[in-house]
């Protein structure tokens, strides 16, 4: 097996992630491990000098630069907050707070925003990753209601008057529940008449 | 050689108090993160604590946050563990580990051979 | 914190044959930005420390034998022996390192048949 630094005449190495290709020596050498940085360059007698990142920065891939990337926290003010802290393999990870969604991203996300509310009748469709785009509000399924302004709240099913031992005064909608009254309780004049029906 | 050496375990009374030290050779040992991992008898591997290269970032499992302090000194090549206010559940082997990291947060390459701490009246 | 699920308990297996053993966790390991499970496997045999087999999952640690391979992504793992050998009377742990408290297995113990 041969192991670098060895020449290549055809400007590719045999593993793309492990080495790269010095067109000054027409070599290829080896990249240096997640977590590390080249602290001295490869040359025709000598592989690539590998050295830990120091604290506060990372590099998260096999890599040939010359320094590691600088740590950096998800910032409150642009609506972030953090899942994972930053290690000399990895960058910080973050994710929008609670109630926000990602309004702008650039490989990453980099500023969230509010979600919107959802009237009364309709409640936000469950997405597959939080925060990840703002609320599509979808009416309430049939038996169901939300009666609030909110960007979480979810529609309940209307009360069953009969579970509890009572009877159906006013049937529900979709912005309010089943209104319920004891079976003993005279309905109210206006009415009668369909009660008598 | 790599080496990590426990000392500083023993028979302690609850409510009792004990530091444990590991001794680092064989690399630089500021470069790189270290924590504490115990071990009850019969039973899982626990992550206790961690701590940053600098010694700048420390980090404890909820069972021991607010009891135990984890701290280093570079100059020494030393990783302590201060243990107040000790439980019966405490009881364990405690190993020191490195990780290959300038932060805690990553796999253990190297283990010490574990110094066991019992707390009991 | 990330709880960490293995099976079996424990696993007979004739010399030579292969040992399968399964590790999953609560939630998704995998980092999107560089495609690596952090995910490590540790073998400890009686009275000795946890020894480091695998990490990202699949990475052999240097000196390892290639009869050991990590495989899976995101939530599910496996720690696989191709060819038991007595040496490999162990147990065997899994472990999560993509969020603090870094978290572990219960272990599965390895004999032979």
């Known amino acids: 097996q041969v192991v670098p630094p060895y020449g290549s005449e055809n400007q590719t190495c045999r593993d793309q992630e492990k080495e790269y290709y010095e067109p000054r020596h027409r070599i290829c050498c080896s990249r240096c491990p997640p977590g590390t940085y080249v602290s001295a360059k490869c040359s025709r007698s000598r592989d690539t000098v590998c050295a830990t990142c120091a604290e506060n920065s990372y590099n998260e891939h096999w890599n040939y630069l010359t320094i590691c990337q600088l740590c950096r926290p998800c910032d409150p003010v642009m609506g972030l907050e953090e899942i994972a802290p930053c290690t000399s393999k990895r960058k910080t990870q973050c994710r929008c707070q609670p109630g926000m969604f990602c309004a702008a991203w650039a490989l990453e996300c980099t500023h969230c925003e509010l979600l919107s509310d959802c009237p009364p009748g309709t409640e936000a469709e469950l997405k597959d990753e939080v925060g990840k785009g703002n609320n599509h509000c979808v009416p309430c399924k049939a038996g169901h209601f939300q009666n609030t302004s909110s960007p979480s709240a979810r529609c309940q099913p209307h009360t069953r008057c009969e579970d509890q031992g009572l009877v159906e005064a006013a049937p529900g909608t979709a912005q309010s529940d089943t209104t319920c009254r004891n079976p003993s309780e005279s309905l109210p004049p206006e009415m009668s008449g369909t009660m008598l029906m | 050689e790599v080496q990590l050496v426990e000392s500083g375990g023993g028979l302690v009374q609850p409510g009792g108090s004990l530091r444990l030290s590991c001794a680092a050779s064989g690399f630089t040992f500021s470069s790189y993160a270290m924590s504490w991992v115990r071990q009850a008898p019969g039973k899982c591997l626990e992550w206790v604590s961690g701590?940053?290269?600098?010694?700048?970032?420390?980090n404890y499992a909820d069972s021991v946050k607010g009891r135990f302090t984890i701290s280093r000194d570079n100059s020494k090549n030393t990783l302590y563990l201060q243990m107040n206010s000790l439980r019966a559940e405490d009881t364990a082997v405690y190993y020191c580990a490195k990780s290959d990291n300038w932060h805690y947060l990553d796999a253990f390459d190297i283990w010490g051979q574990g110094t066991m701490v019992t707390v009991s009246s | 914190d990330i709880v960490m699920t293995q099976s079996p308990d424990s696993l007979a297996v004739s010399l030579g044959e292969r040992a399968t053993i399964n590790c999953k966790s609560s939630q998704n390991v995998l980092y999107s930005s560089n495609n690596k499970n952090y995910l490590t496997w540790y073998q400890q045999k009686p009275g000795q420390p946890p020894k480091l087999l695998i990490y990202w999952a699949s990475t052999r640690e240097s000196g390892v034998p290639d009869r050991f391979s990590g495989s899976g992504s995101g939530t599910d793992f496996t720690l696989t022996i191709s060819s038991l050998q007595a040496e490999d009377v162990a147990v065997y742990y899994c472990q999560q390192y993509f969020n603090t408290p870094p978290t572990f297995g219960c272990g599965t113990k390895v004999e032979i048949k």
């Open positions: 701590i940053s290269g600098s010694g700048g970032r420390t």
